[in-house]
């Protein structure tokens, strides 16, 4: 049997014998074009990608669209795998979503939604999220209805305030809504009572900024 | 209609403590954050915190941590604000205040008609 | 924290005169302003929110403008109703901080 040579996401990786983590190169939908990825292969039976990932502060998320669209930072530490790769690979199968957060006391918990996609850019990559379980909240600290991508220079929330612009970072704002895991990052002794943190409102409350975050996807049927 | 009554008039001496009530009515208590909001006499608003009554959380003004203590009792719709070791510069009008929106502390559109706490020996 | 200056403190004007309030704000609070008014023992009344957006029931002749550090609040033609303390109030960060205040008075 041919070896498979290109991935299209870190379950293809897994599957194929490659199960330790860290980062590999995936390969766009339909496409030669490629992109570094963060795979996770221990969490809940490995094969995930990796799309979002804060620990530290290291790297500015306060991007333009462009750089959302494209990705930025290093797999290896904070980074945004980039939506127009997320938003072709998860238009292609059913992917799940998990959210892991940590705080600043030691807590940790996660959002785990059974089914994910991003619209096309066209769409401003609006998020699609259903089947909400997990210890981070019983209700979605994404707005449901999904809500379309804004950043610093694209704005598309429905609050007339820019809230990419006041609450930094680019993020599926709403009015401005229950979270943003792009938000400044704050360290600790400094990560209360601000409104522009990182923040799942319906874990911590909306004055807490998180200490680390962590976007992961994998197929549905993995 | 939305409607916030808070208790009335205390005077209390320099040291001791004052706890004042703010009753909603006509909204979903949980749905809103509630602020505390305080006014001497003459004088200009000063923002003292806040209080999620969904959570419970809360975020003070850092002139007032470790004095103040903001509370709710989703039973009864009513949230209370206790100010502790009370000094003379204490004295002003505490006004509770309804947030316009749950996730942040953003503007104040609904206000209670004010509580005067007057400190005096 | 973050001041928010206000000017004039006190202005006297007569019916149907255009006042205008303006606030500072010692930072870039971007729109996050609001401003009250406030009557002689009421408490404060919500007039304006992100900088220029009237609340409902407040009549046009209110107007606010500005973002950044820059705001203002226009009264386009005083009602005798308008007589009242006008504070302006920044939401941008933590603490919120309000402005002075600024008395409007019969001339």
């Known amino acids: 049997k041919e070896e498979q040579t290109t991935f299209r996401d870190c379950a293809e990786i897994f599957k194929s014998g490659l199960t330790t983590s860290g980062i590999y190169t995936l390969t766009f939908p339909n496409s030669t074009e490629e992109i570094k990825a963060y795979c996770d292969m221990d969490v809940g039976g490995g094969g995930w990608t990796v799309i979002q990932h804060r620990e530290d502060g290291s790297v500015d998320f306060q991007r333009t669209w462009k750089e959302y669209k494209e990705g930025f930072g290093s797999p290896l530490g904070e980074y945004w795998l980039g939506n127009e790769f997320v938003s072709q690979l998860t238009g292609q199968h059913r992917y799940v979503l998990k959210i892991q957060l940590k705080d600043w006391e030691g807590n940790e918990a996660h959002s785990l939604y059974d089914h994910f996609y991003l619209a096309g850019e066209e769409s401003n990559y609006r998020i699609h999220l259903t089947g909400l379980t997990g210890t981070a909240g019983k209700i979605s600290s994404i707005s449901q209805p999904g809500s379309d991508f804004s950043t610093k220079d694209s704005d598309n929330d429905k609050c007339i305030c820019k809230c990419s612009q006041m609450l930094s970072g680019g993020w599926w704002f709403d009015a401005c809504g229950p979270s943003n895991l792009n938000g400044q990052y704050y360290p600790q002794k400094q990560n209360t009572n601000k409104f522009n943190g990182i923040k799942w409102y319906y874990w911590k409350g909306s004055g807490y900024s998180l200490k680390a975050t962590t976007m992961m996807i994998r197929p549905a049927d993995f | 209609q939305v409607q916030l009554v808070q208790s009335g008039a205390e005077v209390k001496k320099p040291g001791a403590s004052v706890k004042v009530s703010c009753k909603a009515s006509?909204?979903?208590?949980?749905?809103?954050?509630m602020v505390w909001v305080r006014q001497a006499p003459g004088q200009g608003l000063e923002w003292m915190g806040y209080?999620?009554?969904?959570?419970?959380?809360?975020g003070y003004n850092q002139k007032f941590e470790g004095r103040v203590t903001m509370t709710t009792d989703t039973s009864t719709s009513t949230a209370y604000m206790e100010l502790r070791s009370l000094r003379s510069d204490d004295t002003a009008v505490y006004y509770c205040?309804?947030?316009?929106?749950?996730?942040?502390?953003?503007?104040?559109?609904?206000w209670g008609q004010g509580t005067l706490v007057t400190v005096s020996s | 924290d973050i001041q928010m200056t206000q000017s004039p403190s006190s202005v006297s004007a007569s019916v149907g005169d255009r006042v205008t309030i303006t606030c500072k704000a010692s930072?870039?609070?971007?729109?996050?302003v609001a401003w009250y008014q406030q009557k002689p023992g009421k408490a404060p009344k919500l007039l304006i929110y992100?900088?220029?957006t009237r609340d409902t029931g407040v009549p046009s002749r209110f107007s606010g403008s500005g973002s950044g550090t820059d705001f203002t609040l226009t009264i386009s033609s005083l009602q005798p109703e308008d007589f009242a303390t006008y504070y302006c109030?920044?939401?941008?960060?933590?603490?919120?901080?309000f402005g002075g205040g600024t008395k409007v008075e019969i001339k």
């Open positions: 205040a309804r947030t316009r929106d749950r996730y942040d502390v953003w503007y104040f559109d609904v």
């Open positions: 006509g909204y979903s208590f949980t749905d809103y954050n």
């Open positions: 209080i999620d009554p969904y959570n419970g959380g809360t």
């Open positions: 930072q870039d609070v971007y729109i996050a």
């Open positions: 992100w900088a220029s």
């Open positions: 109030h920044q939401y941008s960060s933590y603490p919120p901080t």
